[in-house]
Structure formats: structure tokens, C-alpha cells
Interface confidence: low
């Protein structure tokens, strides 16, 4: 008799999830000398232990603590780039500006980027059919709790000037319900962080409005100011030119507004 399986609203665990996590770990530790001491099998075991045999709606930050401990990593606290709804450009930027880091440039972020995973209560199986959707099913699911945990730790580590890249083509440029808006903003440490600088990325060449005056940006400014952190904002009108000028800052066209 086939065993009844819980049907969730979200996509199932990414195919070949264990192999992917292990391969990414090996690749990361090869590229980053400071993480060569990491035992990737232990990392996978800790990752697996966070969600296997547990109800996928009852995951807690404590479940991920063994993994957090193994993935402890020091990044320059004044070189942190947060992002919201504009991951690709943020990653392109840190690939060029190698001394800056997004969460996905850290080991734990790199391991989980774009992956989905969940298990089943009381079985050692990984559920490849479906996983809980944050809205439709439950928020305390393995993926959401992971990102909440690593995002909180990443924000807590930040110091001096923290940058955040925001998508000017979204209906809400700053969204209080995003990971940035609900987790990272509230975990920046005022005693360490002097300024949050937002970079609002414009979506069209023909768009020259000042999106730093957007109501949602004003809302972000208000939240940040109340936390005794200074706020500044820049429009990035031409993201393509912006990246080009990061690559070639001496280019004569890079003195004008991007």
C-alpha cells in the first residue's frame, strides 16, 4: 500500500540536492583558502540534520545552529552588500568588485542559493515532490528559516557603511515583507553601522525620475533613522554603465552620473 504523502503548495526539493550541496561546498572551499579547513561531509551532515525527519512546518533557527557553527566565516564587515529583489545585478557587481560581499558570496549562502529542500516528519526521506510555500502553507519551513537565520547573522556582522541594492522596477522598491525589509534592516547594529546606503537600480534607459524620493524609500529612511543609523540613497540610472564603470573606473564616460 503506497504511503500517504503530504502535498505542499510549493515546488519539491531540488533534484540531486545532496550532491549539489556537497559539490558546491567542495568548490567553495577550493576557491576560498580561508575556508579550506571546512570538512564538507560534516557540513552536509549538519545541513541534513536541520530538516531530515522533522515536520517541514516546524523548523526553528536552533535546528540550523550546527550548520551555522561549521559555516562560521569572517567577511570584512565594512564591505557588505545587501540586496532586495535584484539578486543577479548584486552578484554581477560583487563578481567585479571582488572586495565586496553579498550573502551568497559566503559559504552558507553559496551552498543554498536557488535551492529548495524539505523532509518529512519521522522519515529519513527528502521530499522531492513538494515543499511548503511560505504564504500558502507555513513560514517556518526549512528554506525560509535557513534564509532568515543566515540573513540575520549576515546583517548582525555588518559595520561602517552598509550598501543595499534595491530594484527600482518593483511596485514596492523597499518591501517590508522581503528578507531585507523584515530581517536584515532590523538586525543591523547601530553601535557598529554608521550608514545604510541604498542604490536604487532603474529598469529602463529612458527613466530619469528620482526614485530616492519614492514613498517606500522614505519609509526605509524612517525605519533606519529610528534605529540611529544614517541613511543615504543613490539612483543608478544605467545599471549596465554602472557595472562597466566598476570594471573600468578610469573610463572617461564614468565621471558623469550613472
Amino acid at each position: 500500500v503506497p504511503r500517504w504523502r503530504q502535498q505542499w503548495s510549493g515546488p519539491g526539493t531540488t533534484k540531486r540536492f545532496p550532491e549539489t550541496v556537497l559539490a558546491r561546498c567542495v568548490k567553495y572551499t577550493e576557491i576560498h583558502p580561508e575556508m579550506r579547513h571546512v570538512d564538507c561531509q560534516s557540513v552536509w551532515d549538519a545541513f541534513k540534520g536541520a530538516f531530515i525527519s522533522k515536520h517541514p512546518c516546524n523548523i526553528t533557527e536552533e535546528d540550523y545552529q550546527p550548520l551555522m557553527k561549521l559555516g562560521t566565516q569572517t567577511v570584512p564587515c565594512n564591505k557588505i552588500l545587501l540586496w532586495s529583489r535584484i539578486k543577479d545585478l548584486a552578484h554581477q557587481f560583487t563578481q567585479v568588485q571582488r572586495d565586496m560581499f553579498t550573502l551568497e558570496d559566503t559559504l552558507l549562502g553559496y551552498l543554498a542559493d536557488d535551492l529548495t529542500w524539505c523532509g518529512e516528519f519521522n522519515t529519513s526521506k527528502i521530499n522531492y515532490q513538494s515543499c511548503p510555500d511560505w504564504r500558502k502553507d507555513c513560514s517556518n519551513n526549512p528554506v525560509s528559516v535557513f534564509w532568515k537565520t543566515v540573513s540575520r547573522r549576515f546583517a548582525e556582522a555588518a559595520c561602517d557603511v552598509v550598501h543595499v541594492m534595491l530594484n527600482g522596477s518593483r511596485s514596492k522598491i523597499f518591501d517590508k515583507n522581503s528578507t531585507f525589509g523584515s530581517v536584515e534592516v532590523h538586525n543591523l547594529q547601530p553601535e557598529k553601522v554608521q550608514t545604510l546606503e541604498a542604490w536604487v537600480i532603474h529598469g529602463g534607459r529612458e527613466d530619469s525620475r528620482d526614485l530616492c524620493q519614492d514613498p517606500t524609500i522614505k519609509e526605509l529612511e524612517s525605519i533606519i533613522s529610528k534605529r540611529n543609523i544614517q541613511f543615504s540613497c543613490k539612483n543608478i540610472y544605467r545599471p549596465d554603465k554602472f557595472l562597466q564603470c566598476v570594471k573600468n573606473p578610469e573610463d572617461s564616460s564614468c565621471t558623469s552620473e550613472i
Partner: antibody
């Protein structure tokens, strides 16, 4: 029901400054959901955007008029104003104030509510 | 500055007929930044379409907008007597510019 009403002199002498006020009733000018603009229409011709203002005071001007235009907002009076300096006969037009729904990013909503317009003639 | 060119300048049609108005931009305009207005003599313009194809509140479904890039169209499927007016397209990517207008008159 929100209404916009333009007011100001109907006749302005050349080289002087044209001053108009738009009074908003039935709603708050301080709402973050809207921005406010001025558009003009010379007799028998098409529409020309002059500039816009957000309740916070952020302004956006038509570059062809920018050197002569000032738009300001007075939230306590629920009004916003237009000043156009060094006017000539070419500035003779019906001047409209209008409201735009403000949405960040993807949709830049156009002007969904207009005043009835006020005719301004530039003549000595 | 993006220039919008409307054609034809005048459209002579009878009630019940279909009207097709064109608006061409001098450079590509994101469709979400294109709007259409109707203006009757002695009145302020009225918003018909925003985002190239979304009808504004209270606008009858005989009005529809389409297009992308540099070519946009306003269609009135069956002209009613109250539809005879001047129609303007507008882009709002940076400097808000209006087209020169198309007058829809009774044939």
C-alpha cells in the same frame, strides 16, 4: 470626491512672473500615494507638461522650462503653486493642475484627475 | 527628449464605426509608461488608458490600448456620439511628453 481648483491672475505682463495656485479639496495633498503636476495648453494647440511635485517637496521639471519654473507645495493649506518667470506671449495658455497616482518603479501612473483649467494671457 | 507623433491628425468616422489611433515614439518607451487621454472642447483631458493597455477607472471597455517599444495604438471598437473628441498619447519615462493629438470627428 477629490477636486482641484486653479486660481491666479488671468492677465500677466511680458517679462513678469506668472503665479498660479492649485487648491486640493476632498483629499490630502500629503498622501504618499499621489504626486501633483502642472500642464498647459496654448490656444488651439496640444498639451505641454510643466513640472510635478511630491508632497515631500521633490520636484521634476520640464527641461525646456526648468530655468523659469518653480513649483512648491504648502501642505498646511493643501495647495501647490506654480511660478513661471520672464513670461512672453508664447506662455499664453490654459494652465491645468492635475493629480497623478504615485507608484514606485514599474508603473509610473499618469495624471488621473485634473482641474478645469485657468486661462492666462500674457499681454501688455 | 522622447517625441511622440500621432497619426492621423484627423479621423472622420460615423457613430458605430471602429477608430484606430496611432502613436509613434522617437525612441523605445517602456509600455508601462504610455498613457492615452481624451479631451473635449472647453474641458480638461480625461485619462483613458495607462500602462499602454490598462483602462482607467470608469472607462468603458470599447476603449482599448495596445503596443510596445515605439508603436502604440488606441482603439475605440464602436464609436459612440460622446467619443468624438481629441485624443492624446503621453509618455512619462522622464520628461512627460504628449503627442500632437488626433481629432476624431463625425463624418
Amino acid at each position: 470626491q477629490l477636486q482641484l481648483q486653479e486660481s491666479g491672475p488671468g492677465l500677466v505682463k511680458p517679462s513678469e512672473t506668472l503665479s498660479l495656485t492649485c487648491t486640493v479639496s476632498g483629499g490630502s495633498i500629503s498622501s504618499s500615494d499621489y504626486y501633483w503636476g502642472w500642464i498647459r495648453q496654448p490656444p488651439g494647440k496640444g498639451l505641454e507638461w510643466i513640472g510635478s511635485i511630491y508632497y515631500s517637496g521633490s520636484t521634476y521639471y520640464n527641461p525646456s522650462l526648468k530655468s523659469r519654473v518653480t513649483i512648491s507645495v504648502d501642505t498646511s493649506k493643501n495647495q501647490f503653486s506654480l511660478k513661471l518667470s520672464s513670461v512672453t506671449a508664447a506662455d499664453t495658455a490654459v494652465y491645468y493642475c492635475a493629480r497623478g497616482q504615485y507608484s514606485s518603479g514599474w508603473y509610473a501612473y499618469p495624471f488621473d484627475m485634473w482641474g478645469q483649467g485657468t486661462m492666462v494671457t500674457v499681454s501688455s | 527628449e522622447i517625441v511622440l507623433t500621432q497619426s492621423p491628425g484627423t479621423l472622420s468616422l460615423s457613430p458605430g464605426e471602429r477608430a484606430t489611433l496611432s502613436c509613434r515614439a522617437s525612441q523605445s518607451v517602456r509600455s508601462s509608461y504610455l498613457a492615452w487621454y481624451q479631451q473635449k472642447p472647453g474641458q480638461a483631458p480625461r485619462l483613458l488608458i495607462y500602462g499602454a493597455s490598462s483602462r482607467a477607472t470608469g472607462i468603458p471597455d470599447r476603449f482599448s490600448g495596445s503596443g510596445s517599444g515605439t508603436d502604440f495604438t488606441l482603439t475605440i471598437s464602436r464609436l459612440e456620439p460622446e467619443d468624438f473628441a481629441v485624443y492624446y498619447c503621453q509618455q512619462e519615462a522622464n520628461v512627460y511628453t504628449f503627442g500632437g493629438g488626433t481629432k476624431v470627428e463625425i463624418k
